[in-house]
């Protein structure tokens, strides 16, 4: 009887979880990403904030630098040059907007163990970098790039013409770091470091938004960001690049951008070295079903940059935007001319191509109906990329090698039966030539983080586990997750259900839609979760529904197209779909059903609530957009077209939520923002909220005050805690 | 030992068809891209088409694209040139040529037949 | 893409060392290989990838160019030597050749 016994003892030991646990972050996750040095070593920092270098095949380590020295100037982050006589020490991070922040740097001299005094860094940096050999240093302050060829040197200025909101030169301006490159900076060091290329985006006649910073003082401060919003003018961009042997000597010499790129507004997207005398540049008209890539020599006899028309290649969409939610950037094969790149197949599948001559001829390296994600490493005998192709569940990420030496290349996937059960969405990060590669899985079962030799695929150690992590989840009841489709129409809309403990499916629950929708998103994934929406599950005993509708990604084009220049009809007529769906399954009470989402999910569950379906009882937005026109050119154009007559002017009248007001009356519906958002501006819901006063409607909301579209810090607790009372007052559970 | 042996050629009038074959042996034909080139008497080798290992790529000098049509064979080890709307000009010994992969994705002729000649003449 | 290759004849003693070259119109990247085609005999392949021996080749012979501009040279002729060479590009089709160089013997 003993077992018996033990079990039960157990079932009254487990406990639900609770709010505080989630708001306390008692269960979230370690990932270890090896910062890789060399093709069998790399740096990471210990527990105790020593910084540890790990040489895999003699399987030494030793602390390069004391968590003393890291102390000494209350360092959170470190990098070491590549001759590995410098490491630099960043702290007073100061964050900015989504990717940048300023810094102040300290370079910590390794050979003597002491700080590099003279010729110190000015403060605050906005974005520094050492070169790929040796130890120069780019860096970027007030606007303008500087350049120093040992630590201690003084700093040559590269550029001059930096201002405050006007001139960024080596760092991105808002809309370019949010929407087209996704980084912090704007520049990039040749393979050797001979050249260092970069970006000038010019923001004069951009309009500003204008909000205001309440602080502490007697007056609110007004914060103004160059924004452009859609249809507006857009920042002028140059790409140049300068010679950092002899920097003085002819001075930064600009790439030409492709006359047919040229011709109208455009973007640049991103620049990738092939060789120190070889670059890669894409570009991106405004209407951005046109992407071109362009390779461009160096030209010794006049130092000048040579981008013949014969190494343009041309990507374009007929069916809807050009790449995913960004042109894919390609990786160079070893031959330093022909790449490999994700695009759209015939039968609009993302699939990798390669390409040497023309994009005509591109030779399809995967196929089928599936996509391939990323590609991670090409060596000479392997490439390596993700995909969701095994077993069709596109919500999954595995590592697959192509051995591209011989022929025909075959194809192995690396994780697909590693740990099954536990781990279906991976990601990896790979030495010099992968030579090894780190494994890094999400889920669904507790994440782990795995070391491999890059020949055999063998596991050499597991890196992170998460131990501890799984030893506070034994007494926890958590809820049940299940990733299924449906088929409604000829669309498989995918869903995840979040399901409570002991779910039961002859009772009736209440559920929660959580929606983001937004154009090459995903929000069915077999990752691991425990947060709010696990906790409204195992505590409140909701269902909770994830759906991937019309224009979420990696399923193909015509999902992923459907909503080409009509955002906000498609996305929420699949989540209604889908509900319909649920109902019928039931288990559902459908007198309590309610939607939420943030941001682009905000946006859809407004127009969810506002459809007159009557399916929903109440729904949360937190930072919506409202209206396309007030958000920003780059990303809203891309899917949107534009905001004029003859072009695509009257959707964005018609996908407002303003226009559905009236709708609203007979929905709950609490409204959330912060009042400092840079990204989905405040004033999206002052629009809402004017539209839903003047047609008299009835509506919960909530600011918070200098808070930006994270809602972070104390805020992340009130919001959750506040959008907890809403849902248990919606579906009357008690307090 | 690899072997490329090309068979078929002979006299054709102009205006006339032939078709031209090439037996493989001593290799795994079916994973090599397979080539025609072309030399006329006393001149220099012309490139005329390619093949690929599974048929699904076929590229040809577009000079000749609409008058020969190169296909292959897998389970007979054979790669065949039909040769129509023959001209003088085409008279030339045709060889056939197969080779390696070579990294990245493309071939090299490094196996070549000993040639079968075709005379177009009235 | 036209190959051009120089000379188009040219005649040298045994021990002696000759350049073979071959401009391209357009770049072909290092996409070249060069053929000995000996009186009534097939080609052979002799380099690819501009300078990459192929299998069996003596070392005499040796690749060098890029861009446009490629040659072929050849250390201390030997008697077997003697024949035509030609270039090929496989950078795009067609994969054109060069017009052939013929080597003889002074």
């Known amino acids: 009887l003993r077992p018996s016994r033990v079990h039960n003892s157990e079932e009254n030991t487990m406990r639900a979880l609770t709010l505080k646990d989630i708001l306390n972050g008692t269960f979230s996750y370690k990932t270890f990403f090896p910062n890789w040095i060399s093709g069998q070593e790399y740096l990471h920092q210990s527990a105790d904030n020593n910084i540890v270098l790990y040489n895999i095949e003699t399987g030494q380590s030793y602390t390069i630098l004391s968590n003393r020295t890291m102390k000494s100037v209350n360092a959170s982050n470190y990098g070491l040059s590549p001759d590995r006589q410098f490491v630099y020490l960043e702290s007073d991070y100061s964050k900015l907007w989504r990717y940048s922040y300023t810094a102040t740097y300290y370079i910590y001299d390794l050979s003597n163990g002491e700080f590099v005094r003279g010729n110190e860094l000015p403060r605050p940096i906005q974005y520094l970098c050492w070169s790929p050999v040796g130890s120069k240093l780019a860096y970027v302050y007030q606007n303008n790039i500087y350049l120093k060829q040992r630590p201690g040197d003084p700093p040559f200025q590269i550029t001059f013409n930096g201002r405050e909101n006007k001139i960024f030169n080596g760092i991105p301006d808002w809309v370019y770091e949010e929407e087209m490159l996704a980084t912090k900076y704007a520049l990039w060091w040749s393979p050797n470091g001979k050249f260092l290329a970069y970006a000038e985006f010019n923001d004069t006649d951009i309009p500003v938004i204008a909000y205001s910073y309440y602080g502490d003082e007697q007056y609110p401060r007004t914060i103004n960001i160059p924004y452009p919003k859609a249809g507006a003018k857009n920042p002028v961009v140059r790409i140049f690049i300068i010679d950092t042997t002899y920097p003085a000597y002819v001075g930064p010499q600009e790439v030409p951008v492709p006359a047919m790129i040229a011709s109208s507004d455009y973007y640049f997207s991103w620049l990738t070295w092939v060789t120190d005398e070889r670059v890669c540049l894409q570009w991106l008209k405004r209407v951005q079903n046109v992407s071109v890539l362009s390779i461009c020599d160096f030209r010794e006899d006049w130092q000048t940059w040579d981008c013949p028309k014969t190494q343009e290649h041309i990507e374009e969409s007929r069916t809807g935007w050009a790449g995913g939610f960004f042109v894919s950037t390609p990786v160079f094969s070893y031959d330093a001319i022909s790449y490999y790149k994700i695009f759209s197949d015939k039968d609009g599948y993302k699939h990798i191509h390669y390409i040497k001559d023309t994009v005509e001829n591109a030779i399809q390296i995967t196929s089928g109906k599936w996509e391939a994600i990323n590609i991670f490493r090409v060596t000479q005998d392997s490439l390596f990329y993700s995909s969701n192709e095994f077993e069709e569940y596109p919500g999954r990420r595995n590592i697959y090698r192509i051995s591209i030496g011989s022929y025909p290349p075959s194809k192995k996937c690396v994780t697909c039966h590693l740990r099954k059960e536990r781990c279906q969405y991976y990601t990896a990060s790979f030495s010099d030539y992968a030579k090894y590669y780190a494994l890094v899985c999400y889920g669904p079962g507790i994440p782990i983080s795995t070391l491999h030799d890059g020949r055999t695929d063998q596991e050499i150690k597991i890196l992170e586990e998460n131990k501890e992590l799984e030893n506070a989840l034994k007494n926890i009841q958590l809820p049940k997750e299940e990733i299924k489709k449906l088929e409604v129409d000829e669309i498989t809309l995918w869903y995840k259900m979040i399901l409570p403990p002991q779910f039961d499916r002859s009772k009736k629950y209440p559920l929660l839609i959580q929606v983001y929708g937004g154009p090459c998103s995903q929000s069915v994934r077999s990752v691991f979760a425990v947060n709010w929406i696990s906790y409204l599950a195992s505590k409140e005993g909701m269902v909770i529904a994830l759906v991937d509708g019309r224009g979420t990604a990696f399923q193909g084009d015509k999902l992923l197209y459907a909503v080409y220049r009509k955002l906000g009809v498609y996305e929420v007529e699949d989540q209604i779909t889908a509900v319909r769906k649920f109902i019928e399954m039931g288990f559902i009470d459908e007198k309590r059903i309610a939607i939420w989402g943030w941001s682009y999910g905000g946006y859809v569950s407004s127009l969810a609530l506002a459809s007159g379906t009557g399916l929903f009882k109440c729904g949360i937005a937190v930072a919506p957009v409202s209206s396309w026109e007030y958000y920003a050119s780059v990303y809203t154009e891309r899917f949107m077209g534009l905001p004029t007559k003859d072009d695509n002017l009257e959707h964005y009248k018609n996908s407002t939520v303003m226009a559905r007001a009236e709708y609203f009356r007979n929905v709950d519906y609490l409204l959330i923002h912060g009042t400092a958002d840079d990204n989905v501006h405040f004033q999206n819901s002052a629009q809402i909220a004017k539209a839903l006063v003047n047609a008299q409607v009835d509506f919960q909301a909530m600011w918070y005050s200098d808070q930006n579209h994270g809602l972070s810090g104390l805020s992340t607790n009130h919001l959750y805690t506040h959008m907890t009372h809403f849902l248990k007052q919606c579906f009357s559970l008690s307090d | 030992e690899v072997q490329l042996l090309e068979s078929g050629g002979g006299l054709v009038q102009p205006g006339g068809s032939l078709k031209l074959s090439c037996a493989a042996s001593?290799?795994?034909?079916?994973?090599?891209?397979m080539s025609w080139v072309r030399q006329a008497p006393g001149k220099g080798l012309e490139w005329i088409g390619e093949?690929?290992?599974?048929?699904?790529?076929?590229n040809y000098t577009p000079s000749l694209k609409d008058k020969f049509i190169i296909s292959r064979d897998n389970a007979k080890n054979t790669l065949y040139l039909q040769m129509t709307k023959v001209r003088p000009e085409d008279t030339a010994l045709y060889y056939c040529?197969?080779?390696?992969?070579?990294?990245?994705?493309?071939?090299?002729?490094?196996?070549w037949g000993q040639g079968t000649t075709v005379t177009v003449s009235s | 893409l036209v190959m051009t290759q120089s000379p188009a004849s040219l005649s040298a003693s045994v021990g002696e060392t000759v350049t073979i070259t071959c401009r391209a119109s357009?770049?072909?990247?290092?996409?070249l290989a060069w053929y000995q085609q000996k009186q009534g005999k097939s080609p052979q392949l002799l380099v690819y990838?501009?300078?990459t021996l192929a299998d069996g080749v003596p070392s005499r012979f040796s690749g060098s160019g890029s861009g446009t501009q490629y040659s072929l040279k050849i250390n201390s002729l030997q008697p077997e030597d003697f024949g035509s060479y030609y270039c090929?590009?496989?950078?795009?089709?067609?994969?054109?050749f060069g017009g052939g160089t013929k080597l003889e013997i002074k």
């Open positions: 040529a197969g080779g390696y992969y070579r990294y990245p994705y493309y071939y090299t002729m490094d196996y």
């Open positions: 357009g770049s072909i990247h290092n996409y």
């Open positions: 093949i690929n290992p599974d048929s699904s790529t076929i």
């Open positions: 090929q590009h496989f950078w795009s089709t067609p994969y054109t």
């Open positions: 990838n501009a300078k």
């Open positions: 001593g290799f795994d034909f079916s994973t090599y891209w």
